[in-house]
Interface confidence: low
């Protein structure tokens, strides 16, 4: 492992298409990829009138973006899919939404997702 | 009505530089992630580069990495993309092309391309 | 990355035939596939987004399904103006990558 990097090895797992898709609906999801590549955790959401659903959460390929991030925060102010990525085992488990430029609004999961 | 005007096209010889802008309207670009995808000639689509809404993620295909760098200029509506160190594979027509979200979603919205040959 | 493979590469048909074209990516990128027409010397369109969903302004006859690793693009009767070559791509992770294409052309 490199100093002071998390590394990845394991993240969690939800399809809210579970079904069409063939997956399980949650779970815990071991992360692969080239060696010479780093992995993440990542996770979308959406807020329908307050409430929390989530799209998916799983394992995410190596991107810079997501570089050295320990939690899982969306800045973007108001999308339609909150997207966020982070390093480190199950450091997708929770998430928030911390607009940039606006009062904090941070949504901490675990989160029942509502039945598919 | 969403527009995307791509401009900066032109014959370059190998190892120059270039910079192609789009200058968007019609939309709020300020919200919007903005993708660079090239076509050479006969050939089929490729992603080169995204931005995210404000710039502070950005991501390149493997092929242009280090060479180009994608920017925008939220106050000017414009994206931009500067291309270093040229080579003859580079030559395609450029598209720039919108997208919602940074991770998942499609490209709904297209320029009309501007052509870059390399070539000495 | 994540490899986009579309086939059939090109394929002849009449106006009012059902045309199926298929892409399959290397692993599963869930419903993270869009499709695109592209007619020459003009910008790619939109189609299909989200493995089923119809763009805006795209006509009922274009259907997309598929989730996990394969897809599907049909155009239930094709139309004079259908004639184009198509792409898939996921948006599943990036880099976006795309399918090869394949041409529709008049039998």
């Known amino acids: 492992a490199i100093l002071g990097r998390s590394e990845t090895q394991e993240c969690l797992f939800f399809n809210a298409n579970w079904e069409r898709d063939r997956t399980n609906q949650t779970g815990v999801e071991p992360c692969y990829g080239d060696k010479d590549k780093r992995r993440h955790c990542f996770a979308t959401w959406k807020n329908i009138s307050g409430s929390i659903e989530i799209v998916k959460q799983g394992c995410w390929l190596d991107d810079i973006n997501c570089y050295d991030r320990t939690d899982c925060i969306e800045k973007k102010d108001s999308p339609e899919v909150y997207f966020c990525c982070c390093e480190g085992n199950m450091c997708n488990e929770k998430f928030s939404y911390f607009p940039e430029m606006e009062v904090t609004q941070p949504t901490s999961n675990p989160v029942t997702p509502k039945p598919p | 009505e969403v527009q995307l005007l791509e401009s900066g096209g032109g014959l370059v010889q190998p190892g120059g530089s270039l910079r192609l802008s789009c200058a968007a309207s019609g939309f709020t670009f300020s919200s919007y992630s903005m993708n660079w995808v090239r076509q050479a000639p006969g050939k089929g689509l490729e992603w080169v580069a995204g931005i995210n809404y404000n710039g502070g993620y950005t991501s390149y295909a493997d092929s242009v990495k280090g060479r180009f760098t994608i920017s925008r200029d939220n106050s000017k509506n414009t994206l931009y993309l500067q291309m270093n160190s040229l080579r003859a594979e580079d030559t395609a027509v450029y598209y720039c092309?919108?997208?919602?979200?940074?991770?998942?979603?499609?490209?709904?919205?297209w320029g009309q391309g501007t052509l870059v040959t390399v070539s000495s | 990355d994540i490899q986009m493979t579309q086939s059939p590469s090109s394929l002849s048909a009449s106006v009012g035939d059902r045309v199926t074209i298929t892409c399959r990516a290397s692993?599963?990128?869930?419903?993270?596939v869009n499709w695109y027409q592209q007619k020459p010397g003009k910008a790619p369109k939109l189609v299909i987004y989200?493995?089923?969903s119809r763009a805006s302004g795209v006509p009922s006859r274009f259907s997309g399904s598929g989730s996990g690793t394969d897809f599907t693009l049909t155009i239930s009767s094709l139309q004079p103006e259908d004639f184009a070559t198509y792409y898939c791509q996921q948006s599943y992770n990036l880099p976006l990558t795309f399918g090869g294409g394949t041409k529709v052309e008049i039998k």
């Open positions: 989200a493995a089923t």
């Open positions: 692993q599963s990128i869930l419903s993270f």
């Open positions: 092309a919108r997208s919602a979200n940074w991770h998942d979603t499609a490209l709904d919205y």
